[in-house]
């Protein structure tokens, strides 16, 4: 069978070979597509429901007004010329349509490194057959499940038109130290040969670098945390973050209720001050970071001074902030 | 909404002639094939005429061939039926169907309207 | 020319019964078959169409089948508002063919 690609909603010619020019004519045409069940004869005479879709032209030919998708299938025709010699023609007929250029939509503008973040969704719309998505990044093909790549993807059919929506959302990990404005673009590939590629306007986001946090450090004066009744206990936060970030005090796990501050003061040592300290600074790009945490323990006249004492009552004593 | 709306009936004499007008409105009416059937007193519905949707094409069955003309005015959204040399056994209710053709069958119907042959 | 051989021409029924119209074509007309209802003084209604879909705003009540040249209407529960006359009609060749008609009555 010759094959033969057409165009959804175009016309298209089918000739009957060894069909004499114009009537009287011996010949038919049969059909087997999605309008019919096993097969359909169409005749010259004929003329009747079937001529909005096919129907037999005075020089034999089969006219098929405006193509549709339930008209894929084969086409036969055999003629017989004034001799008596008889010439089967088969077409095997495929349709298509190309659907409109496709789009990026919820695209953004911005991306983090190091972590996933959904570049947007490409869409295509009014396409026969279905055809595929693909996505590319500096006009290079981007793999899915490779480097951070993950892509999901939808296929939904017009239920009266029978043409193809596709949609593919683009899920990238961009690379810390990579490109701060990479360029993303979609394609969309027909499903029938022959036809070329139809790419989206390209995006380029920037790809924000989160600082690397620096660790929070907590100094304690005096060093060791262990300190003789009634002495004093200086607490220091140290941030290297600029702006400076807020700094809250735990005692136990549990926040103290005093306004923030980067030093803690504990004046007139009890044993109710005795437990596990750190500080938890709040930044606004990063959310919280707390420091290690340190016990602050009381030294009986005569003892040697230990680096960790032991978690002692649960009073707050006297506090002060510098 | 689609809608079809005949007109154009009467009483008529035998031999004698009378043309029907259905407007349409509610869809694009040059995207259509259109029908007349008719269904005379008592009786069941017969096909009459039918026009593909640039009007080059007419259909009819052999009981009313050469005496009636199906025509449309695509401009006008209107669909004629001229009918000559009327006899008794055309006396019926005519309707204008949207469709004829295999992709639609008769979808929509007019109200119709009633020819009477006076003999 | 195709003839449709409906039957049975007229029928008795009950609300709530179940009912079943055929017609059957004299040659292959493939799935080209539609279902019409239609009432004293009404113009018909389409209720199937291609010998299986259901018309928009048509109940489900009312279903079509087909099995090679045999096409069936069925209600599946009569209701008041359909006892009325019901027509099948082929529109795979010219001439277009009405079945004769099936008359449901209230018995």
């Known amino acids: 069978a010759q094959n033969i690609t057409a165009r959804i909603g175009e016309p298209l010619v089918l000739k009957c070979k060894g069909a004499p020019k114009k009537p009287p004519q011996r010949l038919e045409w049969k059909l087997n597509t999605g309008r019919t069940e096993a097969w359909k004869v169409l005749s010259p005479q004929g003329g009747g429901p079937w001529d909005s879709v096919a129907r037999v032209l005075p020089n034999g030919s089969l006219f098929l007004p405006a193509v549709g998708i339930q008209d894929e299938g084969i086409f036969r025709c055999q003629a017989m010329n004034r001799n008596g010699k008889e010439t089967k023609s088969n077409y095997r007929v495929r349709v298509y349509q190309i659907p409109g250029k496709p789009e990026i939509v919820d695209s953004a503008s911005e991306l983090t490194a190091g972590v996933p973040n959904k570049v947007g969704t490409c869409v295509s719309e009014g396409s026969y057959p279905a055809g595929t998505l693909s996505w590319h990044l500096d006009g290079k093909p981007l793999v899915p499940n490779e480097k951070g790549v993950s892509v999901k993807e939808q296929t939904r059919r017009h239920p009266e038109t029978g043409l193809f929506t596709l949609q593919s959302e683009l899920m990238v990990t961009p690379a810390r130290g990579g490109d701060p404005r990479p360029t993303f673009s979609c394609s969309f590939s027909p499903g029938l040969p022959r036809h070329r590629a139809l790419r989206t306007a390209p995006i380029q986001p920037r790809v924000w670098e989160p600082v690397p946090l620096e660790e929070v450090q907590l100094v304690v004066e005096p060093e060791g945390g262990a300190v003789a009744p009634g002495g004093t206990v200086t607490l220091t936060c140290e941030v290297p973050a600029q702006p400076s970030p807020q700094i809250h005090w735990m005692k136990d796990g549990v926040p103290l209720p005093l306004p923030p501050s980067p030093v803690l003061i504990l004046p007139e040592i009890g044993p109710q001050d005795q437990g596990t300290y750190s500080c938890v600074a709040t930044h606004s790009s990063h959310g919280p970071q707390e420091s290690r945490a340190v016990s602050i323990s009381i030294i009986e006249p005569g003892e040697e001074g230990p680096t960790a004492g032991s978690v002692g009552g649960s009073g707050l004593g006297t506090l002060a902030l510098a | 909404e689609v809608q079809l709306v005949e007109s154009g009936g009467g009483l008529v004499q035998p031999g004698g002639s009378l043309r029907l007008s259905c407007a349409a409105s509610g869809f694009t009416f040059n995207n259509y094939w259109m029908t007349w059937v008719r269904q005379a007193p008592g009786k069941g519905l017969e096909w009459v005429a039918s026009?593909?949707?640039?009007?080059?094409?007419?259909y009819y069955p052999d009981s009313v061939k050469d005496r009636f003309t199906i025509s449309r005015d695509n401009a006008k959204n209107s669909l004629y039926l001229q009918m000559n040399s009327l006899r008794a056994e055309d006396t019926a209710v005519y309707y204008c169907a949207r469709g004829g053709d295999i992709t639609t069958g008769l979808d929509y119907w007019g109200q119709g309207t009633l020819v009477t042959e006076s003999s | 020319d195709i003839q449709m051989t409906q039957s049975p021409s007229s029928l008795s029924a009950s609300v709530g019964d179940g009912v079943t119209i055929t017609c059957q074509a004299s040659?292959?007309?493939?799935?080209?078959v539609n279902w019409f209802q239609q009432k004293p003084g009404k113009a018909p209604r389409r209720l199937i169409y291609r010998a299986t879909n259901l018309a928009d705003g048509v109940p489900s009540r009312f279903s079509g089948s087909r099995s090679g040249t045999d096409f069936t209407l069925t209600i599946s529960s009569l209701q008041p508002e359909d006892f009325a006359t019901y027509y099948c009609?082929?529109?795979?060749?010219?001439?277009?063919?009405f079945g004769g008609g099936t008359k449901v009555e209230i018995k």
């Open positions: 026009i593909d949707n640039s009007g080059d094409n007419t």
């Open positions: 009609l082929e529109f795979d060749e010219h001439p277009l063919t």
């Open positions: 040659q292959d007309v493939g799935i080209y």
